[in-house]
C-alpha cells in the first residue's frame, strides 16, 4: 500500500480559479489541434487494476511523464497558457516527490508504460493529445490525491 500521508495534495491546490481556468483553456486549445479522437490517454485502461489508495501514486507518474516528455519539449506552443500552467503542474509534481509505494508497483508501471508508449507511437500528435487532456489530468490528479 502507498505511504498515504505523502501521496496527498491539499484541496487548496485545486481551488484557484485562475490557474484552473488556464489549465482548461490550454487543454481546449490543444484538443482543437488533436485529430485523433479515437484514442484517450487518461481513461479506464490507465486505472485498470489500481486500487483507490494507489491512484495518486499512479497520477504522480503520469504527471511527471507529461511534464518531462510533453510539456517541457512543447513549452513554446499554446501561449500564453503554457507559461502559466507548466510551473503550476511542476509545483504539484514537487509536492508529490515523496509519494512512494511500499511493495510491488509493477501493475502501475505497466499501465503508465502503455500511456507512454501510445504518446511516443503517435509522435508529435501524441504530445498534442496529452496537452489536450490536461483537463482530465488535472481532474484525475485532484480526485486521486486530495
Amino acid at each position: 500500500a502507498p505511504i498515504s500521508s505523502h501521496c496527498r495534495l491539499d484541496k487548496s491546490n485545486f481551488q484557484q480559479p485562475y490557474i484552473t481556468n488556464r489549465t482548461f483553456m490550454l487543454a481546449k486549445e490543444a484538443s482543437l489541434a488533436d485529430n485523433n479522437t479515437d484514442v484517450r490517454l487518461i481513461g479506464e485502461k490507465l486505472f485498470h487494476g489500481v486500487s483507490m489508495s494507489e491512484r495518486c501514486y499512479l497520477m504522480k507518474q503520469v504527471l511527471n511523464f507529461t511534464l518531462e516528455e510533453v510539456l517541457f519539449p512543447q513549452s513554446d506552443r499554446f501561449q500564453p497558457y503554457m507559461q502559466e500552467v507548466v510551473p503550476f503542474l511542476a509545483r504539484l509534481s514537487n509536492r508529490l516527490s515523496t509519494c512512494h509505494i511500499e511493495g510491488d508497483d509493477l501493475h502501475i508501471q505497466r499501465n503508465v508504460q502503455k500511456l507512454k508508449d501510445t504518446v511516443k507511437k503517435l509522435g508529435e500528435s501524441g504530445e498534442i493529445k496529452a496537452i489536450g487532456e490536461l483537463d482530465l489530468l488535472f481532474m484525475s490528479l485532484r480526485n486521486a490525491c486530495i
Epitope: A1, K11, F14, I42, G43, E44, F47, H48, G49, V50, S51, M52, S53, R55, D135, L136, M139, S140, R142, N143, A144, I146
Partner: antibody, heavy 119, light 112 residues
Amino acid sequence: EVQLVESGGGLVQPGGSLRLSCAVSGFSLSSYAMIWVRQAPGKGLEWIGIIDIDGSTYYASWAKGRFTISRDSSKNTVYLQMNSLRAEDTAVYYCARDRFVGVDIFDPWGQGTLVTVSS
Amino acid sequence: AVVLTQSPSSLSASVGDRVTITCQASEDIYTNLAWYQQKPGKAPKLLIYWASTLASGVPSRFSGSGSGTDFTLTISSLQPEDFATYYCQASVYGNSADSRYTFGGGTKVEIK
C-alpha cells in the same frame, strides 16, 4: 460479455438478517471495485457502500454498522450482509461495477433483487 | 455531504421535442458528475460522465454540460425509447468516504 446477477432477496421480518449475492462474469474482482445501491419503491437511488480492488470497504454513514460488504474472488461474487433490518430498508438492491476513469462511474448494473421487510 | 437537486422532478414531452433537465449541486463538484437513465423495472444505465462525455453506445442526441454547481442533460430530439427517469450522480473526493457518492432525486420524462 460483462454480467452482474444479484440474488438472495425476499421477505424478511423486522430485526432479521439477509445476505445478498452479486455474481459477476466477464471481468475480475481483482481489477474493479464494486458498489451496492438501493432504491425504495417509487424513490430515488441511494448509495450503500463500495468494496475496493484490495478488499477495503467504505460505507454511507447511515449504513455503517448494519451493512457489510465482502467478496469471494474465487467465486467471482460480492456480498451484502444486512442486519437489524427495518421496514424502511424495503427496496430493490443493485450491485454495479465501479469503472474509475479519473472519476468513479458505475457501469454496468445488475438487474436488482427485491428485499421486503415486513411482519 | 453534497446535495444534488434535480429539476423538474417530472415533465411531459412529445416525440421530437428538445428536453432539458438540470442538476444543481450544493457545493463545487468540478466536472465530477454522471447521468443515468432508468426505465421502469430495469437497472440504471450510464449515459454521461465527466459532465459531458458520452458513454459508449449512447446515442448522440444525448448531451451533457456544466461544471461547478450547475449541470444540464439535454435530449435534442426525444425518441420513444427515451421515456424514463434520469438521475444525476456526483463523486466527491477529499472528504469523508461515507459521503463520496450522491444521487439526485430523479426526473421522470413522460409522454405528453
